[in-house]
Amino acid sequence: QKSSIEKCSVDIQQSRNKTTERPGLLNCPIYWQQLREKCLLFSHTVNPWNNSLADCSTKESSLLLIRDKDELIHTQNLIRDKAILFWIGLNFSLSEKNWKWINGSFLNSNDLEIRGDAKENSCISISQTSVYSEYCSTEIRWICQKELTPVRNKVYPDS
């Protein structure tokens, strides 16, 4: 039995897979901050995790995915306010009993040192210094991302 949050993540991923490929971003849009090959956008209001997930998709983006500890540190360096928490695209999958990114991959246990419990209705937030497990219903800010790397157009052989 999938939770509503898991269903939401899966639906968004499936709709992404169905969309036709668009040319990739060469530069970050106005208001977005570049961090290596990503563009990041920090919210100025608060929402529970699933609303944050949905709001990023209105910007043709996703909640932040963090590849490794190095990317986490670079992201945290952009956070100016000490006590502010931000949702990222990672939540607890009850069916798989593991932390799952919204792109469907599982958390490598070495990547993030999470403070708090891994349990149902838990989602991950980051601050300037730490990574926390919070109830997904907690209302905090969030970070959206767009990938900067250009997507090559698919070349189809002549029929």
């Epitope: 919210s43 209001t45 608060v46 929402n47 529970p48 709001d55 306010d81 209302e139």
Partner: antibody, heavy 120, light 107 residues
């Protein structure tokens, strides 16, 4: 057109509480975050905090955290700001102000202001 | 807390002349700066966001510039309705702070 209409002036004694309302019209009330900003006589502007009318989630300026409560009633498209344990230096005009974008911190529409006078 | 310092406190200008208002931030705020106009007895009115982007319906005589710690609001040719107090605001941090204001008065 977007309109934010606030409640009338209030006179309060030190130690009392005041609750100011802000009725929104001309747009989807739950679609925009509401902020509260105050202006003491002859002074600049001071941001107090915000409420997401869609969910009721709040975030307050630490300076007011222990004394302010922001709420909303979506059925009547109204936001409220309550400030307790009033002091004379809380005498100010209090404004509700709509956040123009979820991802930027500017205020694109303001209420007309509510004058709160704290005097013994 | 980021302190926004506006200068001058008062600017006396004749109608038709150019007015240049300054706003300095105590730390780098990028371009996350807003300008508002406030007339006596009225609420502030949004003029410019992101340091230089005019809000809908704002006349072209208003322009903003700057990044980092130094910002400028320029009114190219003052009209009678432009005499007011102008405030800058930063949102680089989530504790939004405003400058003390510049009053533009008729010379």
């Amino acid at each position: 057109q977007v309109q934010l209409v606030q409640s009338g002036a209030e006179v309060k004694k030190p130690g009392a509480s005041v609750k100011v309302s802000c009725k929104a019209s001309g747009y989807s009330f739950t679609g925009y975050t509401m902020n509260w900003v105050r202006q003491a006589p002859g002074q600049g502007l001071e941001w107090m905090g915000l409420i997401n009318p869609n969910t009721g989630g709040t975030y307050y300026n630490q300076k007011f955290k222990d004394r302010v409560t922001m709420t909303r009633d979506t059925s009547i498209s109204t936001a409220y700001m309550e400030l307790s344990r009033l002091r004379s230096d809380d005498t100010a005009v209090y404004y509700c102000a709509r956040l123009g974008d979820n991802y930027r911190g500017y205020f694109d529409s303001w209420g007309q202001g509510t004058t709160v006078t704290v005097s013994s | 807390e980021i302190v926004m310092t506006q200068s001058p406190a008062t600017l006396s200008v004749s109608p038709g002349e150019r007015a240049t208002l300054s706003c300095k931030a105590s730390q780098d705020v990028g371009t996350a700066v807003v300008w508002y106009q406030q007339k006596p007895g009225q609420a502030p009115r949004l003029l410019i966001d992101w340091a230089s982007i005019r809000h809908t319906g704002i006349p072209a005589r208003f322009s903003g510039s700057g990044s980092g710690t130094e910002f400028t609001l320029t009114i190219s040719s003052l009209q009678s309705e432009d005499f007011a107090v102008y405030y800058c605001q930063q949102y680089s941090t989530y504790l939004y702070t405003f400058g003390g204001g510049t009053k533009v008065e008729i010379k």
